[in-house]
């Protein structure tokens, strides 16, 4: 009569995490007498999964009634599969022996692969803001997926990015994997409303990729541009000078007026005008009593934005010769002679 063969018909079985896995095994003969066991892995160090003879295996059930007379089906089902269950499973026939049973024959093995979904990608940006034309890095992380094959793409406002580096860990065999990617993005002035998206595609997602997003508004600082101008006034002894603070982001801004280097007034920007690109504008004005000055006045608008070093713009307000001679007594002939704004940044 032919010697017993152990048949494991499937070379591989793939199961989604949380499901049950059925591992099939059949014998061609009832002899020799002895139990069957299932192991994960082969050789020294293999892990016992099920022993027909003894033991408690709460996640394992037999497909057939093993005690049934003439039973040759030794298939098992393992419940609630996790990535840690991945591996090659061997159905092994033992021959009754004394004191211990002896391994008689093994099946060829069934490789169980576990499909586990990646976690929702988490995108994080730089710790400090950067200004336009500078490059910032965004990272994207996802964990717990299996198998290892995974695709990650980066987008900025729907346009695919190419400057990124991705690692999948660990490099070798593992029950599950993690992905880490770093993208480099060059900031532009219009990026306040921009978004970066990390998109992950994996076999478990059935063509519906996972996305993680980050707003460039968290990463960008657009420094303001300053313009100091003089507005026409009816009263000859007064000058109205405005400081137009334009296209800045984020909101936080403090403005100080200086007359000939001395602080005249400090104010914090409150009512801001938002531009279409997400940046803000703000205007501050200073009323100067020209009668109080015998000499020309240098007015400086100094702006501290988002905790950065202050920038400033100056304006030379000329006091007419007529006013200089007569001082504050002469008001009606006071002439305001505006000059070109003086550029300057502190």
């Amino acid at each position: 009569e032919d010697e017993l063969q152990v048949i494991q018909p499937e070379k591989s079985v793939s199961v989604a995490a949380g499901e049950s896995a059925t591992l099939r095994c059949a014998m061609t003969s009832l002899i020799p007498v002895g139990p069957i066991m299932w192991f994960r892995g082969a050789g020294a160090g293999r892990e016992l999964i099920y022993n027909q003879k003894e033991g408690h295996f709460p996640r394992v059930t037999t497909v057939s009634e093993l005690t049934k007379r003439n039973n040759l089906d030794f298939s098992i089902s393992i419940s609630n599969i996790t990535p840690a269950d991945a591996g090659t499973y061997y159905c092994v026939k033992f021959r009754k022996g004394s004191p211990d049973d002896v391994e008689f024959k093994s099946g060829a093995g069934t490789e169980l692969s576990v499909r586990a979904k990646p976690s929702a990608p988490v995108v994080s940006g730089p710790a400090v803001r950067a200004t336009p034309e500078h490059t910032v890095s965004f990272t994207c992380e996802s964990h717990g997926f299996s198998p290892r094959d995974i695709t990650l793409k980066w987008f900025k406002n729907g346009n695919e990015l190419s400057d990124f580096q991705t690692n999948v860990d660990p490099a070798g065999d593992s029950v599950s994997y993690s992905i880490h990617s770093t993208a480099r993005v060059v900031l532009t002035r219009g990026d306040v409303h921009s978004q970066v998206i990390c998109e992950i595609a994996h076999i478990t997602l059935q063509g519906d990729p996972l996305r993680g997003t980050a707003n460039l508004s968290e990463a960008i600082r657009v420094p303001p541009t300053l313009e100091v101008t003089q507005q026409p006034m009816r009263a000859e002894n007064q000058a109205n000078v405005t400081c137009q603070v334009s296209n800045f982001y984020p909101r936080g801004l403090q403005l100080t007026w200086l007359e000939n280097g001395n602080v005249s007034r400090t104010e914090t920007a409150s009512t801001l005008i938002e531009n279409k690109d997400g940046t803000y504008n703000w205007m501050s004005w200073l009323l100067v009593n020209t009668c109080a000055h015998r000499d020309d006045v240098v007015l400086t608008c100094q702006v501290e934005h988002d905790g950065q070093q202050a920038v400033s713009k100056s304006y030379a307000l000329e006091i007419s010769a007529h006013q200089k001679e007569h001082g504050s007594d002469i008001t009606h002939e006071a002439a305001l002679a505006p000059t070109a704004p003086l550029g300057g940044s502190g």
């Epitope: 892995g41 082969a42 050789g43 020294a44 160090g45 090659t88 660990p170």
Partner: antibody, heavy 122, light 112 residues
Framework: QVQLQESGPGLVRPSETLSLTCTVS????????WSWIRQPPGKGLEWIGF???????FYNPSLKSRVTISLDMSINQFSLKMTSVTAADTAVYYC????????????????WGQGTTVTVSS | DIVMTQSPLSLPVTPGEPASISCKSS???????????LDWYLQRPGQSPQLLIY???NRASGVPDRFSGSGSGTDFTLKISRVEAEDVGVYYC?????????FGGGTKVEIK
């Protein structure tokens, strides 16, 4: 580059407990078996036992009653404790990494420590 | 336990010449997955052992191609195609089919 470093007392009194630690640097403990092997002076190699990163242990039956292998993944270390030592336990003790693949099993002890000499003497 | 028997005990070699070491196991190391659970190690004088061959015939990373492993079941051979001075030391075979892992007694290779 993974490196293993054994540490522990070089001299142990008879009937006392031998304790050795192996520190794994430059790599992870995950997905490997971690082995202890010894070599008495002028003799061959003897496998003591190993531990999988999940904590499953396998011991040489000839030493099983006296040996415990444990690991601490948080500090990348695994340890050997051998009780009731005698002069026959005098040897160079090696810790080693054993590669393992789920579909194959063990496929080579590919990284070894430099070994630490333990003498059992009163 | 599986008993591993190596021969010869000592092997004097001439540099540039081939050398061969035999290892026999008391039971087959060939499993149903078609792998032979046998490794070869070299222990140079005063050093730790190093892996040469795993699973019967696979050369470990960084091992020169003058080393090769062959055989199946119970009979295995390690061959060095052209011996070099750095190849001296004790060669061990080890079975990894079942615990306890067991080593052969070793073959000492020395230059003539």
């Amino acid at each position: 580059q993974v490196q293993l470093q054994e540490s522990g007392p070089g001299l142990v009194r008879p009937s006392e407990t031998l304790s050795l630690t192996c520190t794994v640097s430059g790599g992870s403990i995950r997905n490997y078996y971690w082995s202890w092997i010894r070599q008495p002076p002028g003799k061959g190699l003897e496998w003591i036992g190993f531990i999988y990163y999940t904590g499953r242990t396998f011991y040489n039956p000839s030493l099983k009653s006296r040996v415990t292998i444990s690991l601490d993944m948080s500090i990348n270390q695994f340890s050997l404790k051998m009780t009731s030592v005698t002069a026959a336990d005098t040897a160079v003790y090696y810790c080693a990494r054993v590669r393992a693949y789920s579909g194959i099993g063990l496929d080579g002890t590919d990284v070894w420590g430099q070994g630490t000499t333990v003498t059992v003497s009163s | 336990d599986i008993v591993m028997t190596q021969s010869p005990l000592s092997l004097p070699v001439t540099p540039g010449e081939p050398a061969s070491i035999s290892c026999k196991s008391s039971q087959s190391l060939l499993y149903s997955n078609a792998y032979n659970y046998l490794d070869w190690y070299l222990q140079r004088p005063g050093q730790s052992p190093q892996l040469l061959i795993y699973l019967g015939s696979n050369r470990a990373s960084g091992v020169p191609d003058r080393f090769s492993g062959s055989g199946s079941g119970t009979d295995f051979t390690l061959k060095i195609s052209r011996v070099e001075a750095e190849d001296v030391g004790v060669y061990y075979c080890m079975q990894a089919l079942q615990t306890p892992l067991t080593f052969g007694g070793g073959t000492k290779v020395e230059i003539k």
